[in-house]
C-alpha cells in the first residue's frame, strides 16, 4: 500500500509501484512537508534517525536536459542497520529518501537477500509531495517474526534507468534453540556401540547440548552443538533425548526409543488358502519382528499319516508376501504344516502346527496290459486291461474312459466310451469294416482323467474273413504294439 499526503496532511491509502495488493495500517503521515519554493535538502526529512544522506549508493543519473542541467545526486537516508528481536515479536523498519520532483518517475521496491519481495503485503509506501520535493518512506513490517525472516533487507529505487540502493537492514531473529538434527529411534544389537547425533542452532549462539537417558543426564558438562553421543552398548531398551541450551532458554528434543534386537516371535494364524491334489497354498501372520526386519521364512511339512516315516520337508521362501504354495505333495494325503521366520539375530520358534489335506487327483498311470481282439460272430471288439496300482490312482477309481478310433480310406472317426470302476473288460461294436481300430484306455477318478494307455491297433476285415488273433499292449520293455491277425 502507499500513502500520499498533500499539504493538508490527509493520508490516502495508495499502492506502491512494486508491490501488488495492499495492507491497510495506520496511514498517519510521519511528516507533513511545508511548502517550499526551492529545492530543499534531504536532511529536512528524517523519519527514522537524523543523519547525513550517505554516499555509498548515490545515484547521479547521466541524462541531462536540453540545457545540460545535471540532476542532483540521490541517496537513501541512513537508518538503523541491525535489528535484533525475539521470535514471534513484531518489527517495522523503513528506508526514506527525498526525491526532487524533477526526477519525475520513480519506483521503489524491497529486496531481501538479493531477491525482490514481490506481493509483500506488509510493505507500505508513504509519500509526501511538495512543489519541489517528494519525501518517500517505504516501511516494511512483520507482525510475528520467524527464523525465516532473518536476513538483509534493502530498498531499491529505480529512477531514470538508474538504481539507488539503501544501506542494508539486518534482521536477526533470536529465540530458543532450534533443532536441525534430532536423535533418531534405532534398533541395535545387544552390547554393541552406537552413535546418536543432536544439533541445534540459535541465534543466539552458542548452543550447548546435554544428553538424557531414561530421564537422567548422561553428560555433566555440556557439549557445543553439534554433539555426537557414543553409547557403548545396551542390554535393554532405553529412551534418549537431548537438551539444547542458549541464552534464551532451553529446547528439549523428542525422546527416541533405542530397542534391542531379538529373535522374532513365531508366526501366528497359519491358514490354508487353497488345496489341490499336489499343492497347498498357505498364508500366515508374521509375529513380532524382534526390532529387526524379517529376512526369510521356512515352511515345514510332514505327513500326518502315522505309518509314514516322519520325515520333514522344508521349503524356504522370502518373508513377504506371507504366502507360500507348497508343491510336490501327494494327492489325498494329510500333512502337518508349521512356519518359522528369521531376522538377523536368528530363527523364531515354529508356529502352531496345522493340519491340511490334498484333494483327489487324476490317476498318474494308465491301465496296464490292454488287449484287443475281434469277435466276428457278434461283430464286436473285445477289450481287456488290468487296473493301475492303487497308490498311483491318486484317488478313488470311478471308472475308465475308452477311446477307439476308426480309420478307413482316409476317413477317421473317434468314439469315447465310459466304463464303471468294477470292470476290467469292455465290448464295443464294430463301426466300420475293412478298417483299422485304435484303442486307448485311461483310468478316471473324481480328480479327473488319467493318462491314456499306449494305442493298440486291430484290423477289422471285410465280412467273410475267418480267424483273428488278439492284439495287445506289449509288456514293459517290448516294442510298439503290433496287430496280430
Amino acid at each position: 500500500a502507499i500513502t500520499e499526503a498533500r499539504e493538508e496532511a490527509k493520508p490516502y491509502p495508495l499502492f506502491p509501484g512494486p508491490f501488488p495488493g495492499s495492507l491497510q495500517t495506520d496511514h498517519t503521515p510521519l511528516l507533513s512537508l511545508p511548502h517550499a519554493s526551492g529545492y530543499q535538502p534531504a536532511l529536512m526529512f528524517s523519519p527514522t534517525q537524523p543523519g547525513r544522506p550517505h554516499t555509498g549508493n548515490v545515484a547521479i543519473p547521466q541524462v541531462t536536459s536540453v540545457e545540460s542541467k545535471p540532476l542532483p545526486p540521490l541517496a537513501f537516508k541512513h537508518t538503523v542497520g541491525h535489528i535484533i528481536l525475539s521470535e514471534h515479536k513484531g518489527v517495522k523498519f523503513n528506508c526514506s529518501i527525498s526525491v526532487p520532483n524533477i526526477y519525475q518517475d520513480t519506483t521503489i521496491s524491497w529486496w531481501k537477500d538479493g531477491k525482490e519481495l514481490l506481493g509483500a503485503h506488509h510493505a507500505i509506501t508513504q509519500f509526501y509531495p511538495d512543489d519541489e520535493v517528494t519525501a518517500i518512506i517505504a516501511s516494511f513490517s512483520i507482525t510475528s517474526v520467524q527464523r525465516s525472516d532473518n536476513g538483509s533487507y534493502i530498498c531499491k529505487m529505480k529512477i531514470n534507468n538508474e538504481e539507488i540502493v539503501s544501506d542494508p537492514i539486518y534482521i536477526e531473529v533470536q529465540g530458543l534453540p532450534h533443532f536441525t538434527k534430532q536423535p533418531e529411534s534405532m534398533n541395535v544389537t545387544r552390547n554393541t556401540a552406537f552413535n546418536l547425533t543432536c544439533q541445534a542452532v540459535g541465534p543466539p549462539e552458542p548452543v550447548n547440548i546435554f544428553w538424557v537417558q531414561n530421564s537422567s543426564r548422561v553428560n555433566e558438562q555440556p557439549e557445543k552443538s553439534p554433539s555426537v553421543l557414543t553409547v557403548p552398548g545396551l542390554t535393554e531398551m532405553a529412551v534418549f533425548s537431548c537438551e539444547a541450551h542458549n541464552d534464551k532458554g532451553l529446547t528439549v528434543s523428542k525422546g527416541v526409543q533405542i530397542n534391542i534386537k531379538a529373535i522374532p516371535s513365531p508366526p501366528t494364524e497359519v491358514s490354508i488358502r487353497n488345496s489341490t491334489a499336489h499343492s497347498i497354498l498357505i498364508s500366515w501372520v508374521p509375529g513380532f519382528d524382534g526390532y529387526s526386519p524379517f529376512r526369510n521364512c521356512s515352511i515345514q511339512v510332514k505327513e500326518a499319516d502315522p505309518l509314514s516315516n516322519g520325515s520333514v520337508m522344508i521349503f524356504n521362501t522370502s518373508a513377504l508376501p506371507h504366502l507360500y504354495q507348497i508343491k510336490q505333495l501327494q494327492a489325498l494325503a494329510n500333512y502337518s504344516i508349521g512356519v518359522s521366520c528369521m531376522n538377523e539375530i536368528g530363527w523364531s520358534a515354529v508356529s502352531p502346527w496345522i493340519l491340511a489335506s490334498t484333494t483327489e487327483g487324476a490317476p498318474s498311470v494308465a491301465p496296464l496290459n490292454v488287449t484287443v481282439f475281434l469277435n466276428e460272430s457278434s461283430d464286436n471288439v473285445d477289450i481287456r486291461w488290468m487296473k493301475p496300482p492303487t497308490k498311483q490312482q491318486d484317488g478313488e477309481l470311478v471308472g475308465y474312459r475308452i477311446s477307439h478310433v476308426w480309420q478307413s480310406a482316409g476317413i477317421s472317426k473317434e468314439l469315447l466310451e465310459e466304463v464303471g470302476q468294477n470292470g476290467s473288460r469292455a465290448r464295443i461294436s464294430v463301426q466300420v469294416h475293412n478298417a483299422t481300430c485304435t484303442v486307448r484306455i485311461a483310468a478316471v477318478t473324481r480328480g479327473g482323467v488319467g493318462p491314456f494307455s499306449d494305442p493298440v491297433k486291430i484290423f477289422i476285415p471285410a465280412h467273410g474273413w475267418v480267424d483273428y488273433a488278439p492284439s495287445s499292449t506289449p509288456a514293459p520293455g517290448n516294442a510298439d504294439p503290433v496287430l496280430i491277425i
Epitope: A1, I2, E4, Y12, P13, L14, F15, P16, G17, F19, P20, G21, S22, P61, V63, T64, S65, V66, K69, L71, V99, P100, N101, I102, Y103, Q104, D105, T106, T107, I108, G119, T125, F127, P129, D131, E132, T134, I136, N160
Partner: antibody, heavy 120, light 107 residues
Framework: QIQLVQSGPELKKPGETVKISCKAS????????MNWVKQAPGKGLKWMGW????????TYADDFKGRFVFSLETSASTAYLQINNLKNEDMATYFC?????????????WGAGTTVTVSS | DIVLTQSHKFMSTSVGDRVSITCKAS??????VTWCQQKPGQPPKLLIY???TRHTGVPDRFTGSGSGTDFTLTINNVQSEDLADYFC?????????FGAGTKLELK
C-alpha cells in the same frame, strides 16, 4: 490555477508534418513529466509516451516509435508533439496530460486536445 | 502489456439511480488504477486515483473500489451531468493502458 493550453486544430495532407504545442501554467513546468495521449474518432484513449520536462528525455510507447517526436521549450514551459510523414490513421485528437507526482503515473491535469485531420 | 477490460460498452441509467462500472485487469495492478470521465468534445477529467481516492473537487457520489485485477466505479444518485464516457487506466507498469470505456446514457 494549473492549466495546459494546446494549439488549435490542424488540417494536413498525408506525408506532411504537424507540430502540436502544449503550454503549461500555474506550476513549475520542470517538476512534472508530460504525457501524450491519442484518441481516434469514436475510439478510446491510447498512451503515446511521456517526456521528462527537466532532462528532456522522451519515452515512447511501442506503437509510437519512429515518426513521433516529443520535445520541449523549457523557457516557455511548453511541450511539443511532432508527427512526421502523416498517415490517415494519425487522424485523431491528441491530448497532453501532466504526470501527477514522482511516484504516481496517473494524469491529474489534461489539455483540451488538438484535432489533427489528415486528408488528401 | 496489461489489458484493461470494461465489459459494458454502454450502460443505461436514470437520474437518481446508482450505477456500477467495472474494469478488469489482465494481471495484478495492485491499486494503481484511475477513473476518468470524458464528455463529448472535452478532455478526460480525473475522478479517482489509487483505485479509491477521490480527486480534488470530485463530488462524493463517485466512489472507487477494488484492488488486484477487479475494479469498480460506483456513482450514487446519478445526475444528468454524469452522462459521459468513463475510462479506467492502470499505471502499475509501462506502457500505461486504458480501458475501452463505458458510455453512461439515460434509459
Amino acid at each position: 490555477q494549473i492549466q495546459l493550453v494546446q494549439s488549435g486544430p490542424e488540417l494536413k495532407k498525408p506525408g506532411e508534418t504537424v507540430k502540436i504545442s502544449c503550454k503549461a501554467s500555474g506550476y513549475t513546468f520542470t517538476n512534472y513529466g508530460m504525457n501524450w495521449v491519442k484518441q481516434a474518432p469514436g475510439k478510446g484513449l491510447k498512451w503515446m509516451g511521456w517526456i521528462n520536462t527537466y532532462t528532456g528525455e522522451p519515452t515512447y510507447a511501442d506503437d509510437f516509435k519512429g515518426r513521433f517526436v516529443f520535445s520541449l521549450e523549457t523557457s516557455a514551459s511548453t511541450a511539443y508533439l511532432q508527427i512526421n510523414n502523416l498517415k490517415n490513421e494519425d487522424m485523431a485528437t491528441y491530448f497532453c496530460a501532466r504526470k501527477s507526482t514522482v511516484v504516481s503515473r496517473y494524469f491529474d491535469v489534461w489539455g483540451a486536445g488538438t484535432t489533427v485531420t489528415v486528408s488528401s | 502489456d496489461i489489458v484493461l477490460t470494461q465489459s459494458h460498452k454502454f450502460m443505461s441509467t436514470s437520474v437518481g439511480d446508482r450505477v456500477s462500472i467495472t474494469c478488469k485487469a489482465s494481471q495484478d495492478v495492485g491499486d494503481a488504477v484511475t477513473w476518468c470521465q470524458q464528455k463529448p468534445g472535452q478532455p478526460p477529467k480525473l475522478l479517482i486515483y489509487w483505485a479509491s481516492t477521490r480527486h480534488t473537487g470530485v463530488p462524493d457520489r463517485f466512489t472507487g473500489s477494488g484492488s488486484g485485477t477487479d475494479f469498480t466505479l460506483t456513482i450514487n444518485n446519478v445526475q444528468s451531468e454524469d452522462l459521459a464516457d468513463y475510462f479506467c487506466q492502470q499505471y502499475r507498469s509501462y506502457p500505461l493502458t486504458f480501458g475501452a470505456g463505458t458510455k453512461l446514457e439515460l434509459k
